[in-house]
């Protein structure tokens, strides 16, 4: 009998109820092996889910999450919100970022700005909830009587007027 | 291989309780803050509950504070949450996390394995 099982391929059953026939899985139900004595039930996305795959007779569905959701767990068995830029995700939905720190994504969490200082730069940009600061020359290069480090400007093209 | 396993979940009364457990494998469970997450049908991923390593300290989301309790028991490596006054809105799938290290708070997720998930459904 476990023999005749065995020969049932992926996308059916061995039906005991007919003498172990090898019987077509059921709509909205797959099997991904051979020698199944079921076939397993469609996962169903609906909700936050949406479709990725279609269920076939011989692989389950697979989800994504909708728009403002991303992904976890094995498989997206979850959907997590997304946060605007300049938030974080905490255990009780979106905060915005601290000052003194910033997320330019719409998940993970806000991360401090860069210390200029300790590249001996400066400032060049401030940094913003959404923005970490840009850093410039160091203070010693802007002194004066320094020698300029920025290069001539190039000639315009004709035609072009100045931005 | 870490490993965390819910049960407990089914087809509950409003008003009703539900006990939930976790067994956890793989890893020295005493030393880990672990966490319960839940995702109803129609909506994302919403924290439930976490309690430390220790077990000393627990955190709770305001919609379950003084229904749910979390507790562990270290030396059945099994974390639990008692539900208790169900309502419609608790109806969902139920995970149970863990964080990465000893101590949780209400604030940072920090969590680096999911479980499965059990179905908790309340009928009126």
């Known amino acids: 009998l476990q023999d005749l099982c065995s020969n049932c391929p992926a996308g059916t059953f061995c039906d005991n109820n007919r003498s172990q026939i090898c019987s077509p899985c059921p709509p909205n139900s797959f099997s991904s092996a051979g020698g199944q004595r079921t076939c397993d039930i469609c996962r169903q996305c609906k909700g936050v889910f949406k479709t990725r795959k279609e269920c076939s007779s011989t692989s389950n569905a697979e989800c994504d999450c909708i728009s403002g959701y991303h992904c976890l767990g094995a498989e997206c068995s979850m959907c997590e919100q997304d946060c605007k830029q300049g938030q974080e995700l905490t255990k009780k939905g979106c905060k915005d970022c601290c000052f003194g720190t910033f997320n330019d994504q719409k998940r993970g969490i806000c991360r401090p700005w860069t210390n200029c200082s300790l590249d001996g730069k400066s400032v060049l940009v401030n940094g913003t909830k959404e923005r970490d600061v840009v850093c410039g020359p160091s203070p010693a290069d802007l002194s004066p009587g320094a020698s300029s480090a920025t290069p001539p400007a190039p000639a315009r093209e004709p035609g072009h007027s100045p931005q | 291989e870490v490993q965390l396993l819910e049960s407990g979940g089914g087809l509950v009364q409003l008003g009703g309780s539900l006990r939930l457990s976790c067994a956890a494998s793989?890893?020295?469970?005493?030393?880990?803050?672990m966490t319960w997450v839940r995702q109803a049908p129609e909506k994302g991923l919403e924290w439930v509950s976490s309690?430390?390593?220790?077990?000393?300290?627990?955190y709770y989301a305001d919609s379950v504070k003084g229904r749910f309790t979390i507790s562990r028991d270290n030396s059945k490596n099994t974390l639990y949450l008692q539900m208790n006054s169900l309502r419609a809105e608790d109806t969902a799938v139920y995970y149970c996390?863990?964080?990465?290290?000893?101590?949780?708070?209400?604030?940072?997720?920090?969590?680096?394995?999911w479980g499965q998930g059990t179905t908790v459904t309340v009928s009126s």
């Open positions: 996390a863990k964080e990465r290290t000893g101590t949780t708070g209400d604030y940072y997720y920090n969590v680096d394995v």
């Open positions: 793989g890893f020295t469970f005493s030393s880990y803050a």
């Open positions: 309690i430390s390593g220790s077990g000393g300290n627990t």
